[in-house]
């Protein structure tokens, strides 16, 4: 079964950038993926979430698994450079996670690197994983263009960058990857597509918002995700089904720091994906390891 | 340690075909692209174009679209450019480079004379 | 396509002195996604194959000495050396990788 946490998520969500701590078993589809690609000179190494589909697939952003290159062709990492750990709550003791090496390492054939496009991808596990009440699927949403409808309330966790001191700048420039040790999480509402358009065109530089992409967070800022969140669910409760279904992943955001005013967080449209993946898992959507809410 | 061989000097004449080759070691050669580039004589930089060897994948300047053909053979770690219809225009010194162009090898003089 | 410009295209400098040579992009260079701009610096001996310099505009490659340095975004960068040594005869390319690649015509350095 997807998509049902066995310890149910608030309901309330204090005013990740202004979020909270996660208790263990909040997110058990949460997974924190680990590239330390040594083919680069020198060795790089970078973090993002994902979100567990079924024992043996992961979702997440197709940039998070492109190679960190100095031009902006894309290739995908290697995936002996792939570490993957679910039921993971505290980043400084990965004893009671379980941590697995990749299989499969699929980006989407149409990801772009210029506008982030197609932000999204997935990655085979080498073994399957055993669920528990820490390690459950999420669900996938339905095929549908129009995505999560404006104003809905979705939950997005995280081992990013939780202090808004911190400038996105600084990280890059230092090399250095600040995690938050343990997983946040924040409630963000969907904005409408039309505003989040809006808010990026009248900034300099590409920042085109398509239609496989929406927006979410607050027009007054303080809440948001950021730098090493990339890739990890935004979850909505589905109301008839009353389970957890992942309608977006973490992809951009815009120039300024994280949480800035009239900044929205931009995640790919998990819904105009579903055909995709379900064709690259090779499981008909009828007899779904984790499933789609119907 | 890494190193890209290049194939030796080729005296062609003009219309006819060559094929150059660049052998990879030190590193796993489906990890990166390789990438060629021409240099004609006290003359600049130009990119012809490169190939992924994990997929084949290439592409190309279009420039160099009819003129160059690039191949892999992951067996022997071997990329390989073929340039067709040769013109005086096409004497140069093509170089192969790889990782990112932290690897390049040490290049291959065409001279095209009849 | 992209054109790469640099400028001068030559210029002969005494051994000690300090160099900036310039490089202008037909567009920006800075992809909005990734924060980087996607510029390299490249130096070629007389005889030998290019090497690499300077990638993202302003990161070093490993090896290169300090006195090399790459700045700039958007559509203008530079390289300067801070202290020309007499080894650091060569042309000097600039390249974009924003979008496929492109070369710029170089600068000959030549000591004085």
């Known amino acids: 079964e997807c998509g049902q946490p066995s310890r149910s998520l608030p309901s309330l969500v204090k005013r990740i950038i202004g979020g909270r701590n996660a208790e263990p078993g909040l997110f058990p589809w949460q997974a924190l993926i680990v590239v330390e690609d040594t083919s680069r000179v020198p060795n790089d190494k970078w973090f993002g979430s994902g979100a567990l589909l079924s024992e043996s697939w992961i979702l997440t952003a197709a940039h998070v698994l492109r190679s960190q290159r100095r031009d902006t062709t894309v290739i995908p990492v290697s995936k002996e450079h792939v570490t993957v750990y679910l039921g993971l709550h505290d980043v400084r003791d990965k004893s009671g996670a379980v941590n697995s090496s990749a299989a499969r390492v699929v980006l989407h054939p149409d990801f772009n690197i210029q506008n982030y496009n197609h932000d999204i991808a997935l990655v085979q596990l080498q073994e399957p994983v055993p669920l528990g009440p820490h390690v459950m699927p999420v669900c996938l949403p339905r095929l549908e263009p129009e995505g999560p409808s404006p104003h809905m309330l979705g939950l997005v966790a995280g081992w990013g960058i939780s202090n808004p001191n911190v400038t996105v700048d600084e990280i890059i420039s230092s090399g250095t990857r600040t995690l938050s040790d343990v997983l946040q999480y924040v409630k963000l509402p969907v904005v409408p597509h039309a505003e989040c358009k809006t808010s990026y065109e009248s900034r300099s530089g590409n920042y085109s918002v398509t239609e496989n992409m929406f927006c979410a967070g607050y027009y007054e800022g303080g809440k948001d995700t950021c730098l090493g969140d990339s890739g990890g669910a935004f979850v909505i409760l589905d109301d008839l089904s009353q389970r957890w279904v992942v309608q977006g992943l973490v992809s951009w955001g815009g120039p300024e720091e994280c949480g800035s005013k009239q900044v929205y967080g931009v995640y790919t449209k998990v819904s105009n994906y579903v055909d995709w993946v379900w064709e690259q898992m090779g499981s008909p959507q009828g007899r779904a390891p984790g499933g789609t809410v119907s | 340690q890494v190193q890209l061989k290049q194939s030796g000097p080729e005296l062609v004449k003009p219309g006819a075909s060559v094929k150059l080759s660049c052998k990879a070691s030190?590193?796993?050669?489906?990890?990166?692209?390789i990438n060629w580039v021409k240099q004609r004589p006290g003359q600049g930089l130009e990119w012809i174009g490169w190939?992924?060897?994990?997929?084949?994948?290439?592409k190309y300047n279009d420039k160099f679209k009819d003129k160059a053909t690039l191949t892999v053979d992951t067996s022997s770690n071997t990329a390989y450019m073929d340039l067709h219809s040769l013109t005086s225009e096409d004497s140069a010194v093509y170089f192969c480079?790889?990782?990112?162009?932290?690897?390049w090898g040490q290049g291959t003089l065409v001279a095209v004379s009849s | 396509d992209i054109v790469m410009t640099q400028s001068p295209s030559s210029l002969a400098v005494s051994a000690g002195e300090k160099v900036t040579m310039t490089c202008k992009s037909s567009?920006?260079?800075?992809?909005?996604?990734?924060?980087?701009?996607?510029l390299a610096w490249y130096q070629q001996k007389p005889g030998q194959s290019p090497k690499l310099l300077i990638y993202w505009a302003s990161t070093r490659e490993s090896g290169v000495p300090d006195r090399f340095t790459g700045s700039g975004s958007g559509t203008d960068f530079s390289l300067t050396i801070s202290s020309v040594q007499a080894e650091d005869l060569a042309v000097y390319y600039c390249k974009q990788s924003y979008n496929l690649y492109t070369f710029g015509g170089g600068t000959k350095l030549e000591i004085k």
């Open positions: 480079s790889s990782l990112e162009d932290t690897y």
């Open positions: 030190g590193y796993t050669f489906t990890t990166d692209d």
């Open positions: 190939i992924y060897p994990r997929d084949d994948r290439t």
């Open positions: 567009q920006s260079l800075l992809n909005s996604r990734t924060r980087k701009n996607y």
